[in-house]
């Protein structure tokens, strides 16, 4: 990526990292408002299978791992990409490498949610207050879990699937940070490990990932008043370990690998009329990228 | 029942390329992390590749990274690994093999497929 | 990368003995260690995952245990078709290794 300044835009579509081949550094952001696409300052080590969010403006990448020719080593860093700058800075590392990490932002605050280190499955789950820059661990999770969809609503973090060692899971389950305690919530209706998981309009969406046999076009919600699973419209492409976030009231999933081919295909999901259409490319094909939305 | 069936092997000439296939009967590939595994004439096994099915990265022993690439076609059920800048160290047998768990060891092999390089 | 040392490297013995295989991990690798099998121009075959797992269709009289770096194999009572060479993996961390190989012969 280049090194200048980033131009001063609004809310844009950050993708960090992937995999093709070797774990990447790209950093690029798609504008939806005329989709262009910037190439932006590199991650400072190459890193695929990690998690993006963003808190106060500035994004982070956290976990993954470096696959490169050299070797393969899991991460447990945690980076944060300042937009106005167009630069990135190492923040405190997590307890332990998280490769196929979740993440997700209550108050501030960051929860790393599983992933894996070696063939260890995390269950446990850490928090970090980038105001002290530390990491504190809080209550495990119930079931271990990699490739793990989490997304938070109502100030509640849910995590959604995943792969325990064994078995691709559909099993979900939904921590409250007042108890400090993770409850199971209705299962899916199916299995679904590196799926995309998001929040939309109350509900949590799941889109595509894989069951254990093949890749997923299909998509499901929970809607957290009903307590149950509901399929929508599938996405025009299989995929597993994609990118998700929400813009604008619309879902947007880019890449991803169907069981052959790395995508480069970016879909967005309108929810009113219930149908996926393909909106650009990502300027290569890659799975395991971290996705995040700039905030207004 | 099970079964992985790999081909493609022979003699090839130092610098020279191979493309092995592992194909699989009664089970499907995509179910399963595929790796190759070698063993020269008279030794013991050596793990040379891996790909992930759910993510599709791959993993290389340093002593193959940049000369092997192992891949998938889950619609053939087969998977592969091309052979590139081969050297008189790489003669062996070659195996492929199904790994259902991250813990687990290789509970589906397949017969092997000889691989000489000499000139 | 870890080492897997295994010993012995041969070892002769007689149907009906109990017969013990050592490999040990030049680090934690906690229990992700199988055990194989291999008969001469034959392909590996797995007997032991986890490092204590009986798998499908082996017979009971093999068994895995660990003490920390430690991992044995162990054949209760050697059946003629148990002469063979036996090899640990580790796939705790990248890359995967195996030990150098056990070739248990008749006495």
């Known amino acids: 990526g280049s090194m200048g300044h980033a131009p001063k835009v609004g809310r844009l579509i950050y993708t960090a990292g992937g995999y093709f081949r070797q774990s990447l550094s790209y950093l690029e952001a798609y504008n939806p408002s005329d989709g262009t696409w910037l190439d932006l300052a590199d991650l400072q080590v190459p890193r695929s299978g990690l998690a993006g969010c963003v808190v106060g403006g500035l994004l982070y990448a956290v976990g993954g791992r470096n696959n490169s020719p050299d070797g393969n080593t899991d991460s447990s860093a945690l980076d944060c990409y300042n937009p106005m700058t167009n630069q990135w800075s190492p923040c405190a590392p997590m307890s332990v490498p998280r490769n196929r990490i979740g993440v997700g932002v209550i108050d501030g605050h960051i929860y790393a949610v599983g992933g894996s280190h070696g063939c260890i499955h995390h269950n446990s789950v850490e928090r970090y207050e980038p105001e002290r820059d530390e990491w504190h661990l809080v209550a495990p999770m119930l079931t271990r879990r990699i490739g793990v969809g989490v997304a938070v609503l109502n100030r509640l973090l849910y995590a959604v699937g995943g792969f325990d060692g064994t078995n691709r899971l559909n099993s979900a389950e939904c921590y409250y940070p007042e108890r400090n305690e993770w409850r199971m919530i209705t299962a899916m209706n199916t299995i679904r490990s590196g799926a995309g998981v998001c929040v939309l309009h109350n509900c949590i969406y799941a889109a595509g990932g894989y069951d254990g046999q093949d890749q997923l076009n299909s998509v499901e919600r929970y809607d957290v008043e009903t307590e149950t699973w509901t399929f929508v419209a599938p996405m025009k492409h299989r995929r597993s370990a994609l990118g998700i976030t929400v813009h604008q009231g619309r879902i947007y999933v880019l890449g991803g690998y169907d069981g052959h081919t790395f995508l480069d295909s970016v879909e967005c999901y309108d929810p009113d009329t219930d149908t996926w259409s393909e909106v650009t490319r990502m300027t290569s094909g890659r799975s395991g990228v971290g996705v995040a939305v700039t905030m207004e | 029942e099970v079964q992985l069936v790999e081909s493609g092997g022979g003699l090839v000439q130092p610098g020279g390329s191979l493309r092995l296939s592992c194909a699989a009967s009664?089970?499907?590939?995509?179910?399963?992390?595929i790796h190759w595994v070698r063993q020269a004439p008279g030794k013991g096994l050596e793990w040379v590749a891996s790909?992930?099915?759910?993510?599709?990265?791959?993993l290389y022993a340093k002593s193959v990274a940049g000369r092997f690439t192992i891949s998938a076609d889950t619609s053939k059920n087969t998977a592969y690994l091309q052979m590139n800048s081969l050297r008189a160290e790489d003669t062996a047998v070659y195996y492929c093999?199904?790994?259902?768990?991250?813990?687990?060891?290789?509970?589906?092999w397949g017969q092997g497929t000889l691989v000489t390089v000499s000139s | 990368d870890i080492q897997m040392t295994q010993s012995p490297s041969s070892l002769s013995a007689s149907v009906g003995d109990r017969v013990t295989i050592t490999c040990r991990a030049s680090?934690?690798?906690?229990?992700?260690v199988a055990w194989y099998q291999q008969k001469p121009g034959k392909a590996p075959k797995l007997l032991i995952y986890?490092?204590?797992s009986l798998y499908s269709g082996v017979p009971s009289r093999f068994s895995g245990s660990r003490s920390g770096t430690d991992f044995t194999l162990t054949i209760s009572s050697l059946q003629p078709e148990d002469f063979a060479t036996y090899y640990c993996?580790?796939?705790?961390?990248?890359?995967?290794?195996f030990g150098q190989g056990t070739k248990v012969e008749i006495k």
């Open positions: 093999a199904g790994l259902l768990w991250s813990w687990g060891g290789a509970g589906s």
């Open positions: 009664g089970f499907a590939i995509s179910a399963s992390s």
């Open positions: 790909i992930d099915p759910e993510t599709g990265e791959t």
């Open positions: 680090q934690s690798v906690s229990s992700a």
């Open positions: 986890s490092a204590s």
């Open positions: 993996q580790q796939s705790y961390s990248f890359p995967s290794t």
